[in-house]
């Protein structure tokens, strides 16, 4: 069944998530109208290869035309209108950047399949096996289900055979004892010689049959244990390992991890089969104690079978003890694995063997750096204590799906103070944000006479003492989880591995897509690659060191790539989220590319991008204008920082931005958001209506107050040759001498600092045509 059709049949809660996937950049109507064709194209390839993207984009327009003519024949006016509008939009937006639409479609299709997968898992748990989405199971998983079913069947068959062998043995035992008690066995010389001989033959025959049956059972048990071992290996080394890797990816902003319920069902099923088999092996021992003979296969093989089944069950239980939710501070949900001392963090463990008899039986204890006491001292790492409720009993009541879990909600870390200010050793080789720590969870299971020690641990965490360490700590978490699936390599940063651009690019995009509604486009990523690696054509496979990513300053800058980018991420999330979600912020674009795309556009066309020189994160706009001689000029305003955006929204800044020309008249240089979206259409909805800007006048006053409006104004000279930001205080001297402003951002054309005027309060009040 086509993916789009499957999606239509989903539950409302999933449909809501589906709606969130689609926006103006790729309208849902288009997805609906061209569903089969869209699903037949290789969008991921198109997203990485310009020539293919161009081809697919042109084919897309062709498909739209065909669909349009179908609507024409059906006289469907509304759909005709919508389709024409969509086509115009696509042409205006993606004709020059077809890889962008390819990336968007690829992402949507991928997210759709994830949604189907999630729904399928949920449906399976809810017993809706006939639901169309339940079919979304990989071939490998189907095989696994098959193997598990086979194991269950073999266990049941053995159960039957055990009953049969027990019956045969009881019958043999009865006959043997009867003959013995009647003294027939000594009576071979008596009158009943032939009858007794006959009975003896029957008895021997029964013993032979018993021996054969025992051998058959022992052999089948050995085969069953091998089958269990195979299924267990698949479950733990593949499925569970995949889940753990996906958890790592989800931790660093990647796609959300699939739910553990299906895995829990599989593991529980296998564990149940193992316990039943263990009982069968115990039964063999009982049978052997009742009847044994020379060459008895039970005597020979039972101890080894017992050992194997116990080992399998023990290992399964150990593997089934997992950290379902990695340590995370509730105030920083999108940055797990970074913990600040003295701040509460939460974490959750789960046992994927869902045995009701274990409810409230397992007491979990949490500790930190359990196995590295001496190592830590040698390495000079800090040492910590866990404070708060560090023991919890696992139960099935707290979780909404009845899983056997324990959630720790009130844990905090405190550093163990030593004489030298907290570091266990003065010559510590790693900075604190590269120091990795493990949170360990321990418990003991007593089940059917077995004692099993369970232990699991979190992914490595970075412990900070000040929130200003968060960016570097998060960089460490990104680098670790991007490059290794080793769950406990705390020495990772003593020799950090090198990443490739492809890996880094994906993770950087996740930093946006996980907390906003859009990731980074190929074009945006190429700009970032240029910043990290210098000019190049193909960055795929290029290597990036940990130092280059996070520690070394960028060329000509006083800060690292990551510090700069992290501040931009923060800026986006806190100040310009809605505009970013709409796709209005081009964000990362090189000067050359900016000039290239704007120079062909009419005056007043502008784009929004991030500052390259602002460490704290800044956003600016660049626009096209014509100078007196009619020559095209590209101008940029001095970047707005968080400080300024605290006082006024970026949308309002854009809407109100003016240039004061030589005749002191205020004009707005910003007309169309690139490529050709009218400014009001793009930003109007994000500005407060003027009526809301001030409270009504004091009812007791004679006349209402005059309304005021903050606007940003750039004073400019006629020549438009100022290359650097202008400070309001030094405007005169700058105009006279044109001296350099420090930390300025070189620009393609003029770069202006805007002065913010309050039209009522400032003495240098400018009249604005509002």
């Amino acid at each position: 069944m086509a993916q789009w059709n499957q999606l239509q049949q989903l539950d409302t809660r999933y449909l809501e998530q589906l709606h969130q996937l689609y926006s103006d950049s790729f309208p849902m109507e288009l997805r609906q109208f061209l569903a089969p064709w869209i699903e037949s194209q290789d969008w991921a390839y198109a997203a990485s290869k310009e020539s293919h993207a161009t081809l697919v984009f042109h084919n897309l327009l062709g498909e739209i035309d065909q669909q349009y003519s179908r609507f024409l024949q059906e006289s469907n006016v509304l759909y005709q209108h919508n389709l024409r509008r969509i086509k115009q939009f696509l042409q205006s937006r993606y004709l020059e950047k077809p890889m962008e639409i390819a990336r968007i479609v690829a992402r949507c299709l991928w997210e759709e399949s994830r949604l189907l997968q999630t729904a399928a898992t949920a449906a399976q748990q809810g017993g809706q096996a006939n639901h169309p989405t339940a079919a979304v199971v990989t071939e490998k998983q189907q095989m696994l289900e098959q193997h598990l079913q086979d194991v269950r069947k073999r266990v049941q068959d053995l159960e039957q055979k055990m009953k049969v062998v027990e019956n045969l043995q009881d019958d043999f035992d009865f006959n043997y004892k009867t003959l013995k008690s009647q003294g027939d066995m000594q009576d071979l010389n008596g009158n009943n010689q032939s009858v007794t001989r006959q009975k003896m033959q029957q008895l021997e025959q029964m013993l032979t049959a018993l021996d054969q049956m025992r051998r058959s059972i022992v052999s089948e048990l050995a085969g069953l244990l091998s089958a269990m071992e195979y299924v267990q290996k698949t479950l733990t080394d593949e499925e569970l390992a995949d889940w753990k890797r996906r958890q790592q990816i989800a931790c660093i902003g990647g796609p959300p991890n699939i739910c553990l319920d299906r895995l829990e069902n599989w593991i529980t099923s296998l564990a149940e089969s193992q316990l039943q088999t263990r009982q069968q092996i115990k039964k063999l021992e009982e049978l052997q104690q009742k009847v044994s003979y020379k060459g008895d296969p039970i005597v020979q093989h039972r101890p080894m079978l017992e050992e194997r089944i116990v080992e399998l069950f023990r290992n399964l239980m150990k593997s089934a003890f997992v950290v379902e939710r990695q340590p995370c501070m509730p105030m920083h949900p999108d940055r797990p694995l970074v913990i600040k001392t003295g701040v509460q963090f939460t974490t959750k463990v789960r046992l994927l063997v869902k045995f009701p008899e274990l409810n409230y039986q397992l007491k979990i204890k949490v500790c930190i750096d359990k196995d590295s006491g001496d190592v830590a001292a040698l390495r000079g790492s800090r040492k910590f204590n866990i404070l708060g409720t560090n023991t919890k009993v696992m139960n099935m009541e707290e979780s909404n799906n009845g899983s056997l879990s324990a959630e720790f909600k009130h844990l905090t870390l405190r550093e163990q103070r030593c004489g030298n200010g907290g570091r266990a050793n003065c010559d510590a080789s790693l900075i604190v944000t590269e120091e990795l720590h493990l949170i360990t969870f321990e418990t003991e299971v007593y089940h059917q006479g077995l004692k099993i020690d369970l232990e699991t641990h979190s992914l490595p965490v970075v412990v900070i003492s000040n929130i200003c360490q968060m960016p570097n700590a998060w960089a460490s978490i990104l680098w670790y989880n991007m490059l290794t699936n080793n769950p406990k390599n705390v020495n990772f940063f003593t020799k950090p591995p090198i990443g490739t651009w492809d890996q880094v690019a994906e993770v950087l995009s996740w930093q946006f897509s996980s907390t906003t509604k859009r990731g980074l486009s190929i074009e945006q990523l190429t700009t970032l690659a240029e910043k990290l690696l210098g000019p190049g054509v193909n960055y795929s496979g290029c290597q990036i060191t940990w130092a280059k990513f996070c520690k070394e300053n960028m060329a000509g800058k006083g800060f690292s790539f990551w510090v700069w980018l992290d501040n931009i991420i923060d800026l986006v999330k806190k100040y310009i989220l809605a505009l970013w979600n709409e796709g209005y912020i081009m964000g990362f674009i090189s000067k050359e590319r900016e000039r290239a795309i704007l120079s062909t556009k009419p005056p007043g066309t502008f784009l929004l991008r991030f500052s390259e020189s602002s460490k704290e994160g800044g956003v600016t706009f660049t626009w096209v204008e014509k100078d007196i001689s009619g020559k095209t000029q590209i101008q940029s305003v001095e970047p707005y920082t968080k400080q300024q955006l605290n006082n006024m929204s970026f949308a309002e800044i854009i809407m109100g931005y003016k240039i004061m020309d030589a005749t002191n008249i205020l004009v707005s240089p910003l007309v169309y958001l690139y490529p050709d979206i009218p400014k009001e259409e793009a930003f109007g909805k994000y500005c407060r209506p003027e009526s809301q800007e001030h409270p009504e006048a004091d009812p007791g006053s004679a006349a209402p107050y005059l309304k005021t409006k903050f606007i940003c104004v750039t004073p400019t000279t006629c020549s438009n040759t100022i290359d650097l930001p202008m400070s309001p205080r030094t405007l005169d001297s700058l105009m006279q001498f044109g001296n350099n402003g420090e930390g300025a951002e070189p620009s393609a054309g003029g770069q202006f600092e805007s002065l913010t005027f309050d039209m009522e309060l400032t003495s240098e009040c400018a009249t604005s045509p509002m």
Epitope: V164, N167, D171, F174, Q198, M213
Partner: nanobody, 126 residues
Framework: EVQLVESGGGSVQAGGSLRLSCVAS?????MGWFRQAPGKEREGVAA????????HYTDSVKGRFSISRDYVKNAVYLQMNTVKPEDAAMYYC??????????????????????WGQGTLVTVSS
Amino acid sequence: EVQLVESGGGSVQAGGSLRLSCVASTYTGCMGWFRQAPGKEREGVAALSSRGFAGHYTDSVKGRFSISRDYVKNAVYLQMNTVKPEDAAMYYCAAREGWECGETWLDRTAGGHTYWGQGTLVTVSS
């Protein structure tokens, strides 16, 4: 589920001999033979319990028919001697998991589940 497969049926002259065999898919405590002549009800012929090795026979075949088992092969045999025309019938192998298979089973008043074979036909020519 126990599967039973009979063999050995065929035509035999009155006063002659015939040996019927039945192999079971698994061990059962009780195995025996029943028969059904056209237009008549099914009746018990002979049964052998795994306990005590004693065979039980319906009166009409006592001294002529003999039942035996091979525990290794999970088989039961019916040796038919001095066959009479009234012995002609469809012969069914039967088995049950319990070991009690005396007269109560043969006259089909015993409880418990009985497994049946497809039957093998015995005809008697005079």
